[in-house]
């Protein structure tokens, strides 16, 4: 049946042609239409979708001088560097009045040497450790068959016979190169060459051999390193902050670690200059000519307590009749642990030494035996931790109390449980 206005006749007098070529090709599609009145904008479709950012040019030629006259409109779509995404069915589209007109289709196809979508990448692997490499290529034309090469030697008798997209390597003991060839009806394309660097395996069994307040001796078992001997191992130690939370495998310590290098063998190292009674985390990595292994997990360790490195300071001893008052201050030298208390020793010229544990107090009143006529009385004080006593102070002679000097009342050693008022005599 005839249409209402016979306005359905296509205005297109030239439709897009076909293009088939290899990747990178540049080509042009063209369509032409003849319209009465104002020429429309020509749109390009690929597989039915308008190409918003098409590289197209439109030329319009009037066939007369009247606005009613016909125009020839030519639109050209340029395809630069043909890719797979450019392939498909192409059409021109125009809106004329309230009608939409679409040209006959032209087709863009791709045919050439295989194109790599994925190629093997350089990487490092631990010696004798399995890994996979990937390679993916496409046509058209299909099929595309892959052939893997290791150190330029094919790993299969023919393309398509060996592994394809993924190559599983059970392990290497030397640094090697891998590439893949893609074969199709048009020929062969070779991928990039990936270098697989063989590094030492992560050391195992990092453990403490011995501990001293400022020293830790550690040992470990080296991992395999292929044909490359280990040149050295590196040990890192970092102070463990309570809230730091170094977990196994956490990437970086929170502060600059203490780093030491060990010649190997032996796979053992003495770490010195540490703080006593301090938690640390340590880890180790070993290096060959190819590079370093991965670090071991952080191992928590702790230096033991030591004895105080110096005696108590500013010791003063004053005598008043049968009583002696002794006062001191905490050692300035490192305690190397938790201070548990002080020991005090006093001795007269012809009397045996008396040894006392004072606890954590820093003053004491001594009740001297006899009438207090013992001569040349001296006092020594030492601080102690769980590890033992620190050095004793030099003997301090007991000075006689002079009138006018404040004489405090202090707790007597004989009555340690009785609290007493303490006067700051100094």
């Amino acid at each position: 049946a005839p249409r209402g206005t016979q306005a359905e006749e296509s205005p297109f007098v030239g439709n897009p042609g076909n293009i088939t070529g290899a990747r990178g090709l540049t080509g042009t599609l063209r369509c032409q239409l003849q319209v009465q009145g104002e020429p429309p904008e020509v749109h390009w479709l690929r597989d039915g979708q308008i190409l918003e950012l098409a590289d197209s040019t439109q030329t319009q030629v009037p066939l007369g001088e009247d606005e009613q006259d016909d125009w020839i409109v030519v639109s050209q779509l340029r395809i630069t560097s043909l890719q797979l995404s450019d392939t498909g069915q192409y059409q021109c589209l125009v809106f004329l009045g309230h009608q939409t007109f679409v040209s006959q289709p032209g087709y863009v196809g791709l045919e050439g040497l295989p194109y790599f979508l994925e190629e093997p990448e350089d990487r490092t692997v631990a010696a004798n450790t399995p890994f996979n490499l990937s390679c993916q290529a496409q046509g058209p034309p299909e099929p595309v068959d892959l052939l893997w090469l290791q150190d330029a030697v094919p790993l299969a008798t023919a393309p398509g016979h060996g592994p394809q997209r993924s190559l599983h390597v059970p392990g290497l003991n030397k640094t090697s190169s891998f590439s893949c060839e893609a074969h199709n009806a048009k020929g062969v394309t070779t991928s990039r060459t990936a270098t697989i660097t063989v590094l030492p395996q992560q050391p195992r069994n990092l453990h403490l051999v011995s501990r001293q307040p400022t020293e830790l001796e550690v040992a470990w078992t080296p991992g395999l390193s292929g044909i490359y001997p280990l040149t050295h191992c590196t040990l890192q130690a970092v102070l463990s902050d309570d809230g730091m939370g170094i977990q196994a495998g956490e990437p970086d310590p929170p502060e600059e670690p203490l780093t030491s290098q060990a010649s190997v063998p032996p796979h053992q190292l003495r770490l010195g200059s540490l703080h006593p009674h301090t938690p640390y985390h340590i880890r180790v990595a070993c290096t060959s000519s190819q590079g370093p292994s991965s670090w071991t997990h952080w191992l928590p360790v702790e230096t033991p307590e030591g004895v105080p490195l110096g005696p108590p300071e500013n010791i003063s001893a004053t005598r008043n009749g049968s009583q002696a008052f002794v006062h001191w201050q905490e050692p300035r030298a490192p305690l190397q642990g938790t201070l548990l208390g002080y020991r005090l020793a006093y001795q007269g010229q012809d009397t045996p030494e008396v040894l006392m544990d004072i606890g954590l107090r820093q003053e004491v009143t001594l009740e001297l035996q006899g009438d207090g006529s013992v001569s040349n009385l001296t006092v020594c004080v030492a601080a102690y931790t769980a590890a033992g006593d620190g050095p004793w102070s030099l003997p301090v002679p007991l000075e006689a109390w002079r009138p006018g000097q404040a004489q405090p009342v202090h707790q007597l050693v004989k009555e340690p449980s009785t609290p007493a008022f303490s006067w700051p005599w100094w």
Epitope: G4, T5, A7, E8, Q68, F95, H98, Q99, T100
Partner: antibody, heavy 118, light 101 residues
Framework: QIQLVQSGPELKKPGETVKISCKAS????????MNWVKQAPGKGLKWMGW????????TYADDFKGRFAFSLETSASTAYLQINNLKNEDMATYFC???????????WGQGTSVTVSS | EIVLTQSPTTMAASPGEKITITCSAS???????LHWYQQKPGFSPKLLIY???NLASGVPTRFSGSGSGTSYSLTIGTMEAEDVATYYC????????FGSG
């Protein structure tokens, strides 16, 4: 053959919304724009606007901007006219009409009567 | 907006009579964009003549159209009873408008 079939008559209260459908058959729906035309009782024809069925872009005449909306369901070859916040002056018969290359309306729906009464 | 004025507004005709309806545009329009419609009482409008002078399919040849610029006309060569209807001109040159009928 080419047909435009509209939905049935509507009775609405002022302030309500009405949505009229226009189902096309016998041709490629996206190749022709769809016009909407109003005819008040005893009055002439008034063009409301049109919708490009390929892109979905509507165009409204000045008197029909705001409360009026054209839409499509391309898969069902159907165009819609929605009138929001109905007023007494919206009482009319509404036609859909296919548009051609020279803006002639070559096929028309049978019309949908909209009555607005409180 | 281009205003289309039709005349006469109403007319009586006898069978066999030749009828001419005019449509005057407030601005010049391309003849490609002037169309005529027929609407019978209780029915939808129907395209009668498109692009000034082309008969739509199924339209009897007694109908004809002509004109250019701002002046267009529709002629019924020999009036028949079935031609009783309201006739509208419509322009698609700018914002579409119908004549008053």
């Amino acid at each position: 053959q080419i047909q435009l079939v509209q939905s049935g008559p509507e009775l609405k209260k002022p302030g309500e919304t009405v949505k009229i459908s226009c189902k096309a058959s016998g041709y490629t729906f996206t190749n022709y724009g769809m016009n909407w035309v109003k005819q008040a009782p005893g009055k002439g024809l008034k063009w409301m606007g049109w919708i490009n069925t390929y892109t979905g872009e509507p165009t409204y005449a000045d008197d029909f901007k705001g409360r009026f909306a054209f839409s499509l369901e391309t898969s069902a070859s159907t165009a819609y006219l929605q009138i929001n916040n109905l007023k007494n002056e919206d009482m009319a018969t509404y036609f859909c009409a296919r548009g051609d290359r020279f803006y002639a309306m070559d096929y028309w729906g049978q019309g949908t009567s909209v009555t607005v009464s409180s | 907006e281009i205003v289309l004025t039709q005349s006469p507004t109403t007319m009586a005709a006898s069978p066999g009579e030749k009828i001419t309806i005019t449509c005057s545009a407030s601005s010049s329009i391309s003849s490609n964009y002037l169309h005529w419609y027929q609407q019978k009482p209780g029915f939808s409008p129907k395209l009668l003549i498109y692009r000034t002078s082309n008969l739509a399919s199924g339209v009897p040849t007694r109908f004809s159209g002509s004109g250019s610029g701002t002046s267009y006309s529709l002629t019924i060569g020999t009036m028949e009873a079935e031609d009783v209807a309201t006739y509208y001109c419509q322009q698609g040159s700018s914002i579409f408008t119908f004549g008053s009928g």
